[in-house]
Amino acid sequence: AFGISGVQKYTRALHDSSITGISPITEYLASLSTYNDQSITFALEDESYEIYVEDLKKDEKKDKVLLSYYESQHPSNESGDGVDGKMLMVTLSPTKDFWLHANNKEHSVELHKCEKPLPDQAFFVLHNMHSNCVSFECKTDPGVFIGVKDNHLALIKVDSSENLCTENILFKLSET
């Protein structure tokens, strides 16, 4: 895993500028792990970052991700139930200027360096469909979630609400 000290030194100012016209309602650093307690790690390889899902050695430090949470208004004409609703959206940044992106064409999750305003591919609708676990749904592709496939993160299509609890799209956030 690459040195995350840069993330630890994130200043408040870094994310004070507005993203897609809004500022995050809250931000914090957390490690990301799967439902089965494998860690999500990030490694610099050939000048680009790779994302891995792996078991860490006993004293190995977990990589941290800066999660920025945004409130998104969902108008009633889209919601289908006659009421305006709010959703939580999140962006995930494991190191300065890099964000997780949904590549819907390749069904992959990638780390891209980008400037603000961040593209829609960097935003994920937050679900907590299972006790103390979260899921990340692509803003750009409803019904498609970040999931685990072959020890990597991938985009996984969820075709019914019963499948929202499949373990491979459930993640745990930990601040320790």
């Epitope: 309602i25 809250t26 914090y28 957390a30 949470y69 969902h74 919601s79 289908g80 139930d81 006659g82 009421v83 609703g85 709010k86 959703m87 939580l88 609708v125 937050l126 679900h127 907590n128 469909m129 299972h130 006790s131 103390n132 979260v134 749904e137 609400s161 019963e162 929202l164 609890c165 601040e175 320790t176």
Partner: antibody, heavy 121, light 107 residues
Framework: QVQLQESGPGLVKPSETLSLTCTVS????????VHWIRQPPGKGLEWIGV???????SYNSALMSRVTISVDTSKNQFSLKLSSVTAADTAVYYC???????????????WGQGTLVTVSS | DIQMTQSPSSLSASVGDRVTITCLAS??????LAWYQQKPGKSPKLLIY???RLADGVPSRFSGSGSGTDFTLTISSLQPEDFATYYC?????????FGQGTKVEIK
């Protein structure tokens, strides 16, 4: 427009099962999590459990062995059953809806008016 | 389970006073904290969510602050309709536990 309404018997005998229903309108149970909370007379609030937007259910471990939450989406209703009740289960029982779609992180924005259930023989 | 400890359990104040209620979580809950107001015989009403966000229709004299384990609800200038009991609640982990409540009474 958003409404939640609890209903059920106000008196339950010890050792029997308490059964309550919450009827909702103005929103979809497929988008919002809904919760049961109770409050004994003169005391604080206790979270009982949640029916999440995806259909999964989580319970308070302190009550888990006795509690069941279920849903009838066709009637826009979800229900609470609490078995083997004692006088300590006497409380006002509330149903409530999440503030956010798909997530409970924003607290409970809408509440029913509550229904008092007394456990007594 | 995460324990939520509110203080004080009760307080007496006058109209126009600045009132502060604190809530301490037994472990970090990021900013996933809500504050509710409850009047006798009524359902709780959401005041603040995500520690600092004012719920719809709530007067701006109410504000919330804090993150991690320490949180505060402030009423900048107490009004007659603010005399009630206030509860904090963590939404970081199930079970979603509440503080024991703070009763704000008229001095």
């Amino acid at each position: 427009q958003v409404q939640l309404q609890e209903s059920g018997p106000g008196l339950v005998k010890p050792s029997e099962t308490l059964s309550l229903t919450c009827t909702v309108s103005g929103f979809s149970l497929s988008k919002y999590g809904v919760h049961w909370i109770r409050q004994p007379p003169g005391k604080g609030l206790e979270w009982i459990g949640v029916l999440r937007a995806g259909g999964t259910i989580s319970y308070n471990s302190a009550l888990m062995s006795r509690v069941t939450i279920s849903v009838d989406t066709s009637k826009n209703q979800f229900s609470l059953k609490l078995s083997s009740v004692t006088a300590a289960d006497t409380a006002v029982y509330y149903c409530a809806r999440d503030h956010y779609y798909y997530s409970s992180f924003g607290g409970f924005a809408s509440w029913g008016q509550g229904t008092l259930v007394t456990v007594s023989s | 389970d995460i324990q939520m400890t509110q203080s004080p359990s009760s307080l007496s104040a006058s109209v126009g006073d600045r009132v502060t209620i604190t809530c301490l979580a037994s472990q970090t809950i990021a900013t996933w904290l809500a504050w509710y107001q409850q009047k006798p015989g009524k359902s709780p009403k959401l005041l603040i969510y995500a520690a600092t966000r004012l719920a719809d229709g709530v007067p701006s004299r109410f504000s919330g602050s804090g993150s991690g384990t320490d949180f505060t609800l402030t009423i900048s200038s107490l009004q007659p309709e603010d005399f009630a009991t206030y509860y904090c609640q963590q939404l970081y982990n199930t079970p979603y536990t509440f503080g024991q409540g703070t009763k704000v009474e008229i001095k």
